[in-house]
């Protein structure tokens, strides 16, 4: 509860709002309103948000802080940033996993689950785009492999194996018989 601020305060402005009887200075981010000011243009009594709660903006009427969200372990979420008095927990996916939105119109607050990223190497393909916000984008087959159906097949190591046209172009030789 501070002394009087500049008396020329405007109740319709950003810094002072009518709370109860008077036009009061709001509470800073990370604080909730314990009691409104007791004089015109005075400071409200503001207290720091308790642990596991937050308020992200300066506010005039919040008499309690919002509860920090818990990341959904069932959806394989992890906390990228822990909750503080001024910011909610930021949930995301651990390295090697990507966000799969649970709704079609995906925004930052949409529910999501984490999916393991495709391992292009295990599929014998080049990694074209690393997995982060969406799944890994795999490219062409690695050297020593050729496209066959949906996968990459290893070049034959002997002339006994069949080597269709694509194989020949990549593996560098054609079966002779």
């Amino acid at each position: 509860q501070g002394g009087t601020r500049s008396p020329r305060c405007d109740c319709a402005g950003d810094f002072h709002k009518k709370i109860g009887l008077f036009c009061c200075r709001g509470c800073p981010a990370g604080h909730y309103l314990k009691a409104p000011c007791t004089e015109p243009c005075g400071n409200s009594t503001c207290l720091v948000c308790p642990q596991d709660t937050f308020l992200a903006w300066e506010n005039h009427h919040n008499s309690e802080c919002a509860r920090c969200q818990a990341c959904d372990e069932q959806a394989s979420q992890v906390a990228l940033e822990n909750c503080s008095a001024v910011a909610d927990t930021r949930c995301g996916c651990k390295p090697g996993w990507f966000v799969e939105c649970q709704v079609s119109q995906c925004v930052s607050s949409s529910p999501f689950y984490c999916q393991p990223c495709l391992d292009c190497g295990a599929l014998h393909r080049h990694t074209r785009l690393l997995c982060s916000r969406r799944d890994t984008d795999c490219g062409t087959c690695l050297p020593g492999f050729y496209e066959h159906g949906d996968g990459c097949v290893s070049c034959p190591t002997s002339t006994l194996g069949s080597c269709p046209e694509r194989c020949a172009a990549v593996c560098g030789w054609r079966q002779m018989f």
């Epitope: 008396p7 109740c11 109860g20 009887l21 007791t38 243009c41």
Partner: antibody, heavy 123, light 111 residues
């Protein structure tokens, strides 16, 4: 015309409770802050509680804080003072009053008063 | 808290004479160019009645023999020509900040 009709006073033992009421008429009750002021026998005036219009924030002096609560029912045009843990020094005539705000200065004066109700705290 | 001190505690004035009551605040009650203080009259057995607001504004319906003056911390209520019906206790009160506080009262009698 503005009228403030009070009720609920009486004799109560120390530690007891009492609820005072003030029925308002003749003005738009919900648009005004309202107060309670008391006067001990043969003594001066002491502010006891105020409740704001609109958001109904309440204010008390330290002498009654945590013992008294002020509330309002705008639908019934009524003001209340709930007094708990009463002490001998709470013995007084209790007045309800309308707080009129003047201009844009956030300045209030009690422009209409009820006739008062006597609260006696004694064993 | 702002302490309001009235003087004198009691006053006897002849009918038709001027009565002056003073009130001093322990700190300024000015805000934005206005003195946030008022004067009340309380007759025996009756509730207080608002006479003057913002130090010098006479409330509607109050006889014009009542006037108020002053600013900052020092204020005066003046009754220019005392009438029999003016016998009462007079209180000053500040609304500058909570808790609202009253002066101890000045008892005005006829000499």
């Amino acid at each position: 015309q503005v009228q403030l009709q009070q009720s609920g006073g009486g004799l109560v033992q120390p530690g007891g409770s009492l609820r005072l009421s003030c029925a308002a008429s003749g003005f738009t009750f919900s648009s005004y802050a309202m107060s309670w002021v008391r006067q001990a026998p043969g003594k001066g005036l002491e502010w006891v509680a105020t409740i704001s219009d609109g958001d109904s924030y309440s204010y008390f002096p330290d002498s009654v804080k945590d013992r008294f609560t002020i509330s309002r029912d705008n639908a019934r045009n009524s003001l209340y003072l709930q007094m708990n843990s009463l002490r001998a020094e709470d013995t007084a005539v209790y007045y309800c009053a309308r707080d009129r705000i003047y201009g844009s200065v956030q300045y209030y004066a009690m422009d209409y008063w009820g006739r008062g109700t006597l609260v006696t705290v004694s064993s | 808290d702002i302490v309001m001190t009235q003087s004198p505690d009691s006053l006897a004035v002849s009918l038709g004479e001027r009565a002056t009551i003073n009130c001093r605040a322990s700190e300024s009650v000015e805000f934005s160019g206005t003195s946030l203080m008022q004067w009340y009259q309380q007759k025996p057995g009756q509730p207080p009645k608002l006479l003057i607001y913002a130090a010098s504004n006479v409330e509607s319906g109050v006889p014009d023999r009542f006037s108020g003056s002053g600013s900052g911390t020092d204020f005066t209520l003046t009754i220019s020509s005392l009438q029999a019906e003016d016998v009462a206790v007079y209180y000053c009160q500040q609304s500058r900040k909570l808790p609202y506080t009253f002066g101890q009262g000045t008892k005005l009698e006829i000499k």
